[in-house]
Interface confidence: low
């Protein structure tokens, strides 16, 4: 890379007197201090008198004694105004100024684009004292320039509260094009137009863009950055990138994949999480979404019984949370279950079908022909019934539940009794005389308690009073309140 000065690069004399303009001398500076903080104050200990500063970039020192003459204006010497170089190269530039020895506490600082450069920049200030003036050279070096080093650099010197500013030195770091906007991966509908954008900057400018699709150039003629490529539509996945060219060479963007939206893959791993008599909770793992978000899913349920009519029940649900409770199913039945999900393009195929079963249900019919009669001699109520016509899906009968409610003079007491499945009769102790006893019976399976029969009432006449506690404990002398006949 060439460091190029846009101005004529004559060596300017840095200062008058014994110092040659090129500084290629064997003069050793009296004081050479590296900048720890970006600038180094020049400390001068010669006798001084304050001068009257002028405003602006030039200070004209004045001496107060009668015999003294005004000193020449203070200003930074001209130097190269524009340095062009390639990225990662080194550069060194400087400011120089001659300061009368009457001044002390002079400080030089470096500024870039209006901000003071502090910290880790490599700046050195050198002092070359003479009888009347001290030449100060502030040099700034960058070992490996980057784009961020582009900008306008100036020196500032404070002298007796006056600020002297150098002419700017423009550093232009040139390199390969740098992308500020690269194409983005997209999921698009088949045969639908879409746009890709690519933008790159120098220096050097201009930057020209070529588009590449699947390793082949799309445009024969380059477009000036920024460039928007309108793709009329794709039928299959493609990879796009853009090439950015300038005088330094070529940079290629990342390749981005443009996917074609398609119907999703079928869900996998449909599994049964829980079964009850009338519902099944399923979960599934969604398949590949076809580059388009899932919208919802359809659960298809058909009876696995070969004698069924083959109708399919369909339940629609949102795509998340991959969980659905299928309701309104028959008890103790076998079902085939499949899941299909959709995106904006369409429905997936149905998942592999899985077999699931509901558990036993509670009986659907109450016991029949319930009769109740009073056995006064033993102070018992006898109950008879007929076994209900149970359906297969109601499960196996495990027993009966008897509810008997005793009502008398504002008192009401309900007792529940459980009896085994083999009986069709039961005997309960009279709880209250001069009262009405209301009896209802329900069949019980492992699936639960079925409906109660219609109530049957019997009046228990006054025949002494049987006391009772508010629990279901039987009256004295009746250790077992229910007897299976």
């Amino acid at each position: 890379a060439i460091t190029e000065a846009r101005e004529e690069a004559k060596p300017y004399p840095l200062f008058p007197g014994p110092f040659p303009g090129s500084l290629q001398t064997d003069h050793t500076p009296l004081l050479s201090l590296p900048h720890a903080s970006g600038y180094q104050p020049a400390l001068m200990f010669s006798p001084t008198q304050p001068g009257r500063p002028h405003t602006g970039n030039v200070a004209i020192p004045q001496v107060t004694s009668v015999e003294s003459k005004p000193l020449p204006p203070l200003a930074f010497k001209h130097t190269v105004g524009h340095i062009i170089l390639s990225e990662h190269k080194g550069v060194k530039f400087n400011c120089s100024i001659s300061v009368p020895n009457i001044y002390q506490d002079t400080t030089i600082s470096w500024w870039k684009d209006g901000k003071e450069l502090l910290g880790a920049h490599h700046a050195i200030t050198q002092f070359y004292p003479d009888d009347e003036v001290t030449a100060i050279i502030a040099s700034f070096s960058i070992t490996s320039v980057q784009r961020s080093d582009n900008g306008s650099y100036i020196c500032k010197m404070k002298i007796n509260n006056e600020e002297i500013v150098s002419d700017p030195i423009y550093i232009e770091v040139q390199g390969l094009p740098h992308f500020t906007k690269q194409p983005e991966s997209m999921n698009v509908t088949r045969n639908t137009a879409f746009n890709l954008t690519c933008q790159a900057v120098g220096p050097p400018e201009p930057v020209n863009i070529f588009w590449v699709q699947n390793s082949s150039r799309v445009n024969e003629q380059p477009e000036k950055s920024p460039s928007v490529l309108t793709v009329p539509g794709l039928t299959e996945m493609a990879v796009f990138s853009c090439e950015a060219h300038n005088d330094k060479g070529l940079t290629v963007s990342k390749g981005v994949q443009i996917n074609i939206k398609a119907i999703p893959s079928p869900p996998t791993e449909v599994s049964i999480r829980n079964s009850t008599a009338h519902s099944i909770l399923i979960s599934w793992v969604p398949g590949f979404d076809g580059y388009s978000p899932f919208r919802n899913c359809s659960i298809q349920v058909k009876e696995a019984d070969p004698l069924s009519n083959g109708s399919v029940m369909i339940f629609n649900t949102s795509a998340l949370p991959h969980l659905y409770q299928i309701k309104q199913l028959q008890a103790l039945a076998n079902y085939s279950i499949g899941v299909s999900c959709m995106n904006e393009i369409g429905w997936s195929a149905v998942s592999p079908w899985i077999l699931a079963s509901t558990t036993e249900g509670a009986p659907s019919v109450a016991p029949l022909n319930v009769t109740v009669f009073l056995n006064e001699s033993s102070d018992n109520v006898d109950i008879r019934w007929m076994k209900p016509p149970t359906k297969q899906q109601d499960g196996e009968l495990v027993g009966y539940r008897i509810s008997h409610v005793w009502q008398s003079a504002g008192i009401s007491k309900e007792l529940l009794e459980e009896v085994g499945q083999n009986g069709s009769r039961a005997r309960i102790s009279v709880q209250v005389h001069n009262a009405t006893c209301t009896v209802r019976i329900a069949a019980v399976t492992r699936g639960g308690v079925g409906p109660f029969s219609d109530p049957v009432k019997i009046f228990i006449p006054a025949h002494g009073w049987v006391d009772y506690a508010p629990s279901s404990t039987p009256a004295p002398g009746n250790a077992d309140p229910v007897l299976i006949i």
Epitope: R295, N296, S298, I314, N316, T317, S318, S340, M342, E344, I345, G346, W347
Partner: antibody, heavy 120, light 108 residues
Framework: QVQLVQSGAEVKKPGASVKVSCKAS????????INWVRQAPGQGLEWMGW????????KYNEKFKGRVTMTTDTSTSTAYMELRSLRSDDTAVYYC?????????????WGQGTTVTVSS | EIVLTQSPDFQSVTPKEKVTITCSAS???????FHWYQQKPDQSPKLLIY???NLASGVPSRFSGSGSGTDYTLTINSLEAEDAATYYC?????????FGQGTKLEIK
Amino acid sequence: QVQLVQSGAEVKKPGASVKVSCKASGYTFTTYDINWVRQAPGQGLEWMGWIYPRDGYTKYNEKFKGRVTMTTDTSTSTAYMELRSLRSDDTAVYYCARGYYDNLYYFDYWGQGTTVTVSS
Amino acid sequence: EIVLTQSPDFQSVTPKEKVTITCSASSIISSNYFHWYQQKPDQSPKLLIYRTSNLASGVPSRFSGSGSGTDYTLTINSLEAEDAATYYCQQGRSVPLTFGQGTKLEIK
């Protein structure tokens, strides 16, 4: 039973907008799409787009993009279709229809239709 | 977009006759995505057949549907006076959802 009841007929001037409503009942409103289909006098059926009430997801026919907006109010189970910048060729009967996802995509229930006349 | 072309546009038939309406698609459509509607004068369209051959609820058994690929057919066996209507095919395979131009059936 499932019912879709639409708002009454409208007469509009060119350049104006119209907003048609469709009140659903008899099913869970958020479970099915509401589609809008129009039929110009003596012409066939033309699908305008759908909205999924659960999340407000819309899909419009490209022909109407930029002019049509479909919205829903789930608290009242009502869908709305607004068509802007009306022209005389927008004169049509506008139907709402429930979209059924048993393999995309058919319309199992229809509203009674709303006649929109665009005339200066 | 998928274009559906119905044939014929218009047909005048006598009661008890058998009627066949065809619908041709511009690209192949799975039978799951193909449906038929009936629209009587001054009424909304009504779903007639879904997924090529399934009768919608309440549709008489004299209606039937068949087809695959790009060609689909609606058949009415033993036409009745109440079948005077315009019949539309529809595809649900891709957006925009599209209908055929319609076939008007007149009873002589």
